[in-house]
């Protein structure tokens, strides 16, 4: 007969999600109104549209992006769907309460929702690594740890460096790629004899995931641009970004290609690779003063995604038991790194420039933030994966590692397998 | 030419409420930021609040956050402030202000270019 | 950061080199701004980026200085820069603050 949930997950997970879903709701109630102050109907619709693109990203770009795994491409996008719902609702609460909360109740701005749902995105690249592995009850930690965690460094960084909200959310690359590893790390990680096939990807889903490339390909810059501050700031970032992703485009086609020895293009490294530029652009996208040194860097980046992709899927699998189509983890590690480093290049550059004595003490913030940013992400990882190994999540059987009948009704299927 | 126009200074009993509008002109008010700067009779330049460009964020000084509102409306090129619960305290001119930006090193710093000639407001019973 | 000007007031000459001093608490790194009231009037800029002179502004006033301490020189007093200086730092995006102002008086 077909698999269903263990009867114990049955019950634990509605009421663990619905018991939460609750205490969220009764959160909203006692503690958040909107902002009420809003005088420009025509500014409310533009400042609404950034926010839709974030949410199109989130849901269908990482939802698909993730959904090529051979039998396991439903849970893929929805699971990412609810990761969405209810990191959304965390964070826009948890940054309210560390932000505003002491002057009163937390004012709910489509800024606030723009934030939030950016948080939440963290928990989406970080999950890459663990989807499969994972039920819906064991996410639900993952997501209120990740945002927690995310929320509680953006504040830290944003008081004692005095970061602004796009310097600090732009730690997200790294911060969420090292969650997602240092989880992946502490979960079992051999795969049982009979799932090898099950962790491969196949052709329709394939094209999903590439779907899912595609749309956040599309809408890469205006996630880039969704926290800066000024008009020239954002056509900057929208900009160097557009250039970074359409060099990292042809970078990852091309590379792929040579890096195969039949010169043929391996869809698993398309995926990640396109979206490169987008990735080491990310800190400093409305810094970056020409086109050319932004096609630079998506070229750079291109390169080093696909390197990557051909070289560490191997270690990764072994050591942290990653499959080697999920391949985002140290993509966005290694992205994320070189987009960090690239700032630092450009503080250095611009300090010399000014003639001014302050550049190591500039340096050393920046890799301070960055250090701060992969041990709270390292450690709060680490606390998550020793919270999902617990027998209370009734996690899947390894013999059911990637597997959407675990989870899903089909009518048609008359046995499981 | 660039001009900074404020108006809906006066006198108010303690506790009360007005609303201070900046009306622009001279230059594309949806592209800069604004602020508020008020000072109070023989005192200093103390800054009250500010707003982004698109009205998507704003940011209050201590002394007036949960009582002062700043907002915009970029199709009248106007600029508020509504000010509730008024103190004493709170008896100054009102300045608004153009923020504008130049790169420096690896982040924008802001500063005020153009300035309003101010209205006053008095909080007495 | 707190910002604190010195001196308070200053009595001084036509012709005279004048310098007025803003320390931060903390390190500001070059965001700091000065500005010039007159009495009855909204202030006008001069000097932004701790060091760059605002467009239409007179080559007698300079600005230096980085980290927390900082200077607005005058080299050559006119009769026109008689007023209040004050500085302002935007290091902190959520908050900016003003010194408490130099009162230049003719002497």
């Known amino acids: 007969m077909s698999s269903k949930y263990p009867r114990s997950v049955r019950r634990c997970l509605p009421l663990w999600a619905l018991t939460l879903e609750a205490a969220l709701i009764l959160l909203f109630y006692f503690f958040t109104h909107y902002d009420a102050s809003l005088e420009d109907q025509k500014g409310l619709v533009a400042s609404y549209q950034v926010g839709q693109d974030l949410t199109v990203m989130a849901a269908i770009g990482l939802g698909f992006l993730t959904s090529s795994f051979r039998r396991h491409s439903w849970s893929s996008v929805a699971f990412n769907l609810f990761m969405l719902a209810l990191g959304v609702q965390w964070a826009i609460l948890l940054d309210g309460f560390l932000s505003q909360f002491p002057s009163g109740k937390v004012v709910i701005t489509l800024f606030s929702i723009r934030l939030a749902t950016m948080s939440a995105l963290s928990v989406l690249i970080s999950v890459d690594a663990v989807l499969g592995k994972v039920n819906l009850a064991q996410l639900v930690v993952m997501v209120l740890v990740e945002v927690t965690a995310l929320g509680n460094l953006r504040m830290v960084i944003s008081n004692i460096f005095n970061t602004d909200y796009h310097m600090n959310m732009m730690h997200i690359y790294v911060f969420a790629a090292y969650f997602g590893l240092s989880v992946a790390w502490c979960l079992p990680k051999p795969l049982p004899e009979g799932t090898e096939d099950k962790d491969q990807t196949a052709t329709i889903p394939s094209l999903s995931a590439m779907l899912g490339a595609l749309f956040l390909w599309m809408f890469w810059p205006s996630f880039n641009s969704a926290l800066l501050r000024s008009p020239i700031e954002r056509k900057n970032a929208v900009f160097n970004t557009y250039y970074a992703v359409a060099v990292s485009v042809v970078t990852a086609i091309s590379g792929s290609s040579l890096a195969h020895p039949q010169g043929k293009i391996s869809k698993t490294y398309v995926h990640s690779a396109v979206l490169a530029g987008g990735v080491a652009v990310g800190t400093s996208c409305h810094l970056i003063p020409s086109p050319w040194l932004a096609m630079v860097l998506g070229l750079v980046a291109g390169l080093i995604s696909v390197g990557g992709a051909k070289y560490l899927p191997g270690c990764c699998n072994r050591v942290l038991g990653i499959p080697h189509s999920s391949i985002m983890g140290y993509n966005f590690s290694l992205l994320g790194l070189l987009g960090e480093i690239i700032y630092i290049v450009l503080l250095v550059l611009d300090t010399v420039g000014a003639g001014n004595g302050m550049i190591g003490f500039q340096v050393l913030l920046s890799i301070g933030e960055l250090s701060l940013a992969i041990v709270i992400a390292l450690m709060s990882g680490l606390l998550t994966g020793l919270l999902l190994n617990l027998k209370i999540w009734k996690a899947p059987h390894e013999a059911k590692y990637f597997d959407d009948q675990v989870f899903w009704k089909f009518p048609h299927l008359a046995v499981g397998f | 030419e660039v001009q900074l126009l404020e108006s809906g200074g006066g006198v108010v009993q303690p506790g009360r409420s007005l609303r201070l509008s900046c009306v622009v002109s001279?230059?594309?008010?949806?592209?800069?930021?604004m602020h508020w700067v008020r000072q109070a009779p023989g005192k200093g330049l103390e800054w009250v609040a500010v707003i982004w460009f698109d009205g998507s964020n704003k940011y209050y000084a201590d002394s007036v956050k949960g009582r002062f509102t700043i907002s915009r409306d970029n199709s009248k090129n106007t600029l508020y402030l509504q000010m509730n619960s008024l103190r004493a305290e709170d008896t100054a001119v009102y300045y608004c202000?153009?923020?504008?930006?130049?790169?420096?090193?690896?982040?924008?710093?802001?500063?005020?270019?153009?300035w309003g000639q101010g209205t006053l407001v008095t909080v007495s019973s | 950061a707190e910002l604190t000007q010195s001196p308070s007031s200053l009595s001084a000459s036509v012709g005279d080199r004048v310098t007025i001093t803003c320390r931060a608490s903390q390190s500001i790194s070059s965001y700091l701004n000065w500005y010039q009231q007159k009495p009855g009037k909204a202030p006008k800029l001069l000097i932004y980026a701790a060091s760059s002179l605002q467009s239409g502004v007179p080559s007698r006033f300079s600005g230096s200085g980085s980290g927390t301490d900082f200077t607005l020189t005058i080299s050559s007093l006119q009769p026109e820069d008689f007023a209040t200086y004050y500085c302002?730092?935007?290091?902190?995006?959520?908050?900016?603050?003003f010194g408490q102002g130099t009162k230049l008086e003719i002497k």
């Open positions: 202000a153009r923020e504008n930006q130049i790169k420096l090193w690896s982040r924008y710093l802001y500063y005020f270019d153009y």
């Open positions: 001279g230059f594309t008010f949806n592209n800069y930021g």
């Open positions: 302002q730092q935007s290091y902190s995006f959520r908050r900016y603050s």
